[in-house]
Amino acid sequence: SGTTNTVAAYNLTWKSTNFKTILEWEPKPVNQVYTVQISTKSGDWKSKCFYTTDTECDLTDEIVKDVKQTYLARVFSYPAGNVESTGSAGEPLYENSPEFTPYLETNLGQPTIQSFEQVGTKVNVTVEDERTLVRKNGTFLTLRQVFGKDLIYTLYYWKSSSSGKKTAKTNTNEFLIDVDKGENYCFSVQAVIPSRTVNRKSTDSPVECMGQEKGEFRE
């Protein structure tokens, strides 16, 4: 049995944000279908996305079982009408993905400023602790619960009337900063994992300014 009409997948790429993890590949199938397998270094391969014509497979359910493990996926190609067909080595044609360690590599999603509250010359800025798809004891963990102190937030803030930015950092989800009385400020935050070598920073959050809905002012 041959696979003369079948081509191996290529450009296998992990797309992952806050642990939502999808494997993408090429080419768009012509008379062929794909099945994906994923494994940790244990070699216990688990099949997903059986005989699909998609060129992506959501592997979130597998990687969230242990985000600190390193995973490898492989994409098998089969002729559309004969999924039992094997290649010259007696097994279906397949290609391996790069290795992927979710804890070290998942992109940090764009954070959101949940609220800010001014009390005199202090402003407390709170970053929303986004829920991830990582579970523990049946409940979904937040980004902070997964990363702990490995995750910091950087706050950029500036007077609405000027462009000079100041920064503050926190390893919680709250900032307490000093501001000038009577001035309105704008805020943006960024998630950072300093210990990482790749994907260290998220994109900046949308800018929120004092005098808008999210804020609260108290003398």
Epitope: S39, T40, K41, S42, G43, D44, W45, Q69, L72, S88, A89, E91, E95, N96
Partner: antibody
């Protein structure tokens, strides 16, 4: 320190059986596939068998299929190779190896010698 | 099965030499290739995996390259400790080793 220590080798007659063991330490045993590789005297390396971390997947070289059985006991951090119907050509040093994904071998034991002779 | 052919089978070289060993696969194995070093009476030692990834603790004078069917292991400046036999291994389809290349003192 990651260590693998093979045992169970020896002299056996053709048609006989032998069980090799490999004691692992220094890593989470069940997190890794493991394998056996052999080397006949003066020859190159030959892959024999691989087993996944759970023990649920096993693979064999054609030369040993049906005669050898790989297994593991994760509670004892030990890998096994049951060798039956041994032949003269099975004479070799048998190495146990840690095998991420069951693909390549990143840690090897020192080896145990199996001699099949009458 | 995928066959792996190494050349040369023996290589004579001197300390300080740049040494290149070739491994050819009978069909494309992408980058799924490892290189090992073995000294007499000792177990093999992993040097390179995924064709070009250097194993932790291996000196940087060792490097691997290639993809598809042709691969090379290069030792940029041969050291006394490097005289040994080197094996390639494919893991695209099950596992097969090359026949080995013995690097000996010229």
């Amino acid at each position: 320190e990651v260590q693998l220590l093979e045992s169970g080798g020896g002299l056996v007659q053709p048609g006989g059986s032998l069980r090799l063991s490999c004691a692992a330490s220094g890593f989470t045993f069940s997190d890794y596939a493991m394998g056996w590789v052999r080397q006949a005297p003066g020859k190159g390396l030959e892959w024999v068998s691989t087993i996944s971390g759970s023990g649920g997947l096993t693979y064999y070289a054609d030369s040993v299929k049906g005669r050898f059985t790989i297994s593991r006991d994760n509670s004892k951090n030990t890998l096994y190779l049951q060798m039956n119907s041994l032949r003269a050509e099975d004479t070799a040093v048998y190495y146990c190896a840690k095998a991420p994904y069951g693909y390549y071998m990143d840690v090897w034991g020192k080896g145990t010698t199996v001699t099949v002779s009458s | 099965d995928i066959q792996m052919t190494q050349s040369p089978s023996t290589l004579s070289a001197s300390v300080g030499d740049r040494v290149t060993i070739t491994c050819r696969a009978s069909q494309s194995i992408s980058s799924w290739l490892a290189w090992y070093q073995q000294k007499p009476g000792k177990a093999p030692k992993l040097l390179i995996y995924k064709a070009s990834s250097l194993e932790s603790g291996v000196p940087s004078r060792f490097s691997g390259s290639g993809s598809g069917t042709e691969f090379t292991l290069t030792i940029s400046s041969l050291q006394p400790d490097d005289f040994a036999t080197y094996y390639c291994q494919q893991y695209k389809s099950y596992i097969t080793f090359g026949g080995g290349t013995k690097v000996e003192i010229k």
